[in-house]
Interface confidence: low
């Protein structure tokens, strides 16, 4: 027994109550005064937070009971006060004393990963033991009670590529991985409390591990032989054809450069198309069909950026053989660009210039061009390649036009080339907002002032980078309509309120409210909208749901009494 030094007559044990006990009353212990001789002459009382609701005391014996299920994670300690009173005199036998009830922990909380989602990036082919990420689980149970909050981690999914340190949650690589085979791994980690002993609770988390690329692949030609033809009249710089090497790496590691081997005449060169990584074989010197009708050259490809430690993967660069046949023939027109993207604001008048495309004859005679345009009747093209509008454009009808321009040589109409022209129509604020729907609005005869009659919203067909914002207002012209008022909710809706108490169906069966709606475009556009409000006999319920049928009769010329 424990005797309180300050209150020498009190005797009690240390009080503990296990959490989550399902019994209706659980005996915790006994409070007793050493003056109590057991003849039921004393009355014990319990005071403080939880007294009477969570804990009760037997007034005669001082036995304390828990009458509610307790949760240590919610509250681990209760501080209560005890009184003992002499029933005969009604006086306190001992001074009021404070005592503590501790809620003891049970293992009722599983470990949880609070930092989800876990995502990690690690270079492909990283050696065993490479750190990937650390996961941490938290357990709400009492760390000082047994192993309730002592966590062990283990790998549920991810073998044989990954391992987890049981006590730290550090994930490491246990086997080299090739990004070119698989670039993302989904690892599942389980955390168990009780150090994994029987009765342990567990939680899991998923870790998404992405492999970043290293330059462990060299570019390789998929074709060992290319055959190209070129007109003898082709100018210097003419593209003869494209060669393509493929590299399974990505980004900078896939960037490549082509070079020409075995070309003593120095007639050809290769430049790279940075967008497609294709090698474009171009003419460096003029060719003459009569002098030489074909050339044989060898091309080589290698990566632009190779780390020293990965150099062994790049020895013996891939090569391909190119045969260039020189032809004595006319060539079709060549457009300056493979495709064109032009822009024009909507609403421009007929005849507005959109832009110019240009094709040239690569042959020696430099034939003039004639242009034709297909794909839309909204545009036309002149002999200079200038595209003009034939109609006013409306972005809300079409924001993009996909046109095809065909160029033919005037001297040889068989020589035809085409290029795609994409025309983007930019938005201007040319649509005023309007009601988002047709409103069938009713107000009860017995409506109160300030009662909501209708909530309205608006729509606008214009494109908006920022969200549309609409502003609602009651038209100043609507001077005769003071029966209703409008409040802009500033969230693209407005509310119509009754501005008076009571309406008369016979005298004024219908009201027309003129509402202005403005948008936030530049310049702002405003529309005038009429809201028809019909008066309805709703009865005592003041519910307009039955008004639709009555309104129908009213519209047809009937009146319901």
């Amino acid at each position: 027994d424990y005797k309180d030094d300050d209150d020498k007559g009190w005797v009690w044990n240390q009080f503990f109550v296990p959490e989550e006990m399902n019994t209706t009353s659980h005996h915790i212990g006994q409070l007793r005064s050493d003056l109590d001789n057991g003849n039921n002459s004393f009355q014990y009382k319990l005071l403080g937070a939880g007294a009477g609701s969570t804990f009760i005391i037997d007034e005669r014996t001082g036995d304390i009971y828990a009458i509610q299920k307790l949760d240590r994670e919610e509250r681990s300690l209760y501080i209560l006060r005890a009184q003992v009173i002499d029933i005969a005199t009604g006086r306190a036998v001992e001074p009021e004393s404070e005592f503590v009830i501790k809620v003891s922990d049970i293992n009722d909380n599983e470990p949880r990963f609070l930092d989800e989602p876990y995502e990690a990036i690690v270079p492909e082919m990283s050696p065993e033991g490479t750190f990937v990420i650390k996961v941490t689980a938290n357990d709400a149970d009492d760390p000082s009670t047994g192993y309730h909050a002592r966590i062990l981690y283990n790998l549920e999914r991810g073998q044989p590529y990954f391992s987890v340190e049981p006590t730290t949650g550090v994930i490491r690589i246990s086997s080299k991985m090739d990004r070119e085979l698989q670039d993302t791994y989904c690892v599942i980690i389980q955390a168990k409390d009780m150090l994994g002993q029987p009765g342990a609770l567990s939680g899991t988390t998923t870790v998404s591990i992405k492999l970043s690329d290293i330059n462990d692949n060299k570019p390789i030609f998929k074709e060992s032989f290319y055959r190209f033809t070129i007109s003898e009249s082709a100018p210097i710089g003419t593209s003869i054809g494209k060669i393509m090497a493929y590299d399974d790496d990505i980004g900078e590691n896939a960037e490549m450069e082509y070079s020409i081997e075995d070309d003593d005449s120095k007639i050809f060169d290769i430049i790279i198309d940075n967008d497609t990584q294709e090698g474009i074989v171009i003419l460096k010197k003029k060719v003459d069909f009569e002098q030489q009708s074909y050339y044989g050259i060898r091309a080589k490809v290698k990566n632009c950026h190779v780390d020293e430690e990965l150099a062994p993967a790049h020895v013996n660069a891939s090569t391909t053989y190119i045969k260039v046949q020189v032809e004595d023939e006319d060539e079709p027109p060549v457009f300056l660009l493979p495709y064109y993207i032009l822009e024009i604001p909507e609403g421009k008048p007929y005849g507005t210039i959109v832009g110019t495309v240009s094709a040239t004859d690569p042959d020696r005679r430099q034939s003039p061009m004639r242009y034709y345009l297909t794909g839309s009747k909204m545009f036309d093209i002149n002999d200079n390649g200038t595209i003009i509008t034939t109609n006013m454009l409306d972005r809300e009808v079409s924001a993009w036009y996909n046109l095809t321009v065909t160029a033919t040589e005037t001297y040889n109409v068989q020589q035809i080339s085409s290029a795609h022209v994409y025309v983007q129509v930019f938005n201007i604020n040319d649509n005023a907002p309007e009601f988002s729907q047709f409103y069938e609005t009713y107000v009860c005869e017995n409506a109160e002032s300030g009662e909501i009659v209708q909530i309205i919203s608006a729509i606008d067909r214009d494109e908006s980078i920022e969200d549309h914002h609409f502003y609602f207002n009651h038209s100043l012209e609507d001077t005769n309509n003071s029966s209703f008022m409008l409040t802009d909710n500033q969230d693209n809706t407005a509310v119509i309120l009754s501005n008076r108490t009571g309406f008369n169906l016979k005298e004024e069966p219908v009201f027309y409210m003129i509402i202005l709606i403005a948008d936030n475009g530049i310049p702002s556009l405003t529309s005038t909208n009429t809201l028809t409000i019909q008066v309805c006999d709703c009865g005592d319920s003041r519910n307009t749901e039955t008004c639709a049928n009555k309104g129908l009769l009213f519209i047809m010329g009937f009146r319901t009494e």
Epitope: G251, N274, D275, E343, I465, E466
Partner: antibody, heavy 120, light 111 residues
Framework: QVQLVQSGAEVKKPGASVKVSCKAS????????IHWVRQAPGQGLEWMGI????????RYAQKFQGRVTMTRDTSTSTVFMELSSLRSEDTAVYYC?????????????WGQGTLVTVSS | QSALTQPPSATGTPGQRVTISCSGS????????VNWYQQLPGTAPKVLIY???QRPSGVPDRFSGSKSGTSASLAISGLQSEDEADYYC???????????FGGGTKLTVLG
């Protein structure tokens, strides 16, 4: 109104790291990219990288790969740019700028800039 | 050195028209929109022209932009003393997967 407010000037020693913050307000934080651009004294503008505040994914300019880390805290609508292994040539004004909803759209709002001085 | 090429300086007198050029490649200007930024002394840059030729509200119509092939230009007519600033062109580069800027042009308004 849209505002990007950056943290104050910093003086750092070579080899150290600096973390600059950029607090956004006046718009939906997760709807627009945030870019970081720096400007050395008397020099031009240099793009460092981009962060998507919606998911936190990043793309860094090749020059800064491995040295720069961009993060965000959606609860405070703040983006952070940390540059490590500082050298004297990193002395610059660092700007955050709001990009569009596409990578290639212009920067419509800029922070006031944060001067980072690297000196032994 | 910058991926986009601008003249380092330009001068003009009040009322004059000045043009600043910006040259790039097929992977940046050739394939993407060009934007122009004005940086007044001691301040952060601000967008002057976006998507080749669009002006944000508040930018006077004295400023105009154009693009042709892999080049772009900024024209300032009716030059004013408050136009004295640094001007930068910028474009997204598909090859670099990032933004590239011009080296900047310092505009001086004489007199």
């Amino acid at each position: 109104q849209v505002q990007l407010v950056q943290s104050g000037a910093e003086v750092k020693k070579p080899g150290a790291s600096v973390k600059v913050s950029c607090k956004a307000s006046g718009y939906t934080f997760t709807s627009y990219y945030i870019h970081w651009v720096r400007q050395a004294p008397g020099q031009g503008l240099e793009w460092m990288g981009i962060i998507n505040p919606s998911g936190g994914s990043t793309r860094y300019a090749q020059k800064f790969q491995g040295r720069v880390t961009m993060t965000r805290d959606t609860s405070t609508s703040t983006v952070f740019m940390e540059l490590s292994s500082l050298r004297s040539e990193d002395t610059a004004v660092y700007y955050c700028a709001r990009g569009g909803i596409q990578l290639w759209l212009h920067f419509d709002y800029w922070g006031q800039g944060t001067l980072v001085t690297v000196s032994s | 050195q910058s991926a986009l090429t601008q003249p380092p300086s330009a001068t003009g007198t009040p009322g004059q028209r000045v043009t600043i050029s910006c040259s790039g490649s097929s992977s940046n200007i050739g394939r993407n929109f060009v934007n122009w930024y004005q940086q007044l002394p001691g301040t952060a840059p601000k967008v002057l022209i976006y998507t080749n030729n669009q002006r944000p509200s508040g930018v006077p119509d004295r400023f105009s932009g154009s693009k042709s092939g892999t080049s772009a230009s900024l024209a300032i007519s009716g030059l004013q003393s408050e136009d004295e600033a640094d001007y930068y062109c910028a474009a997204w580069d598909d090859s670099l997967n990032g933004w590239v800027f011009g080296g900047g042009t310092k505009l001086t308004v004489l007199g």
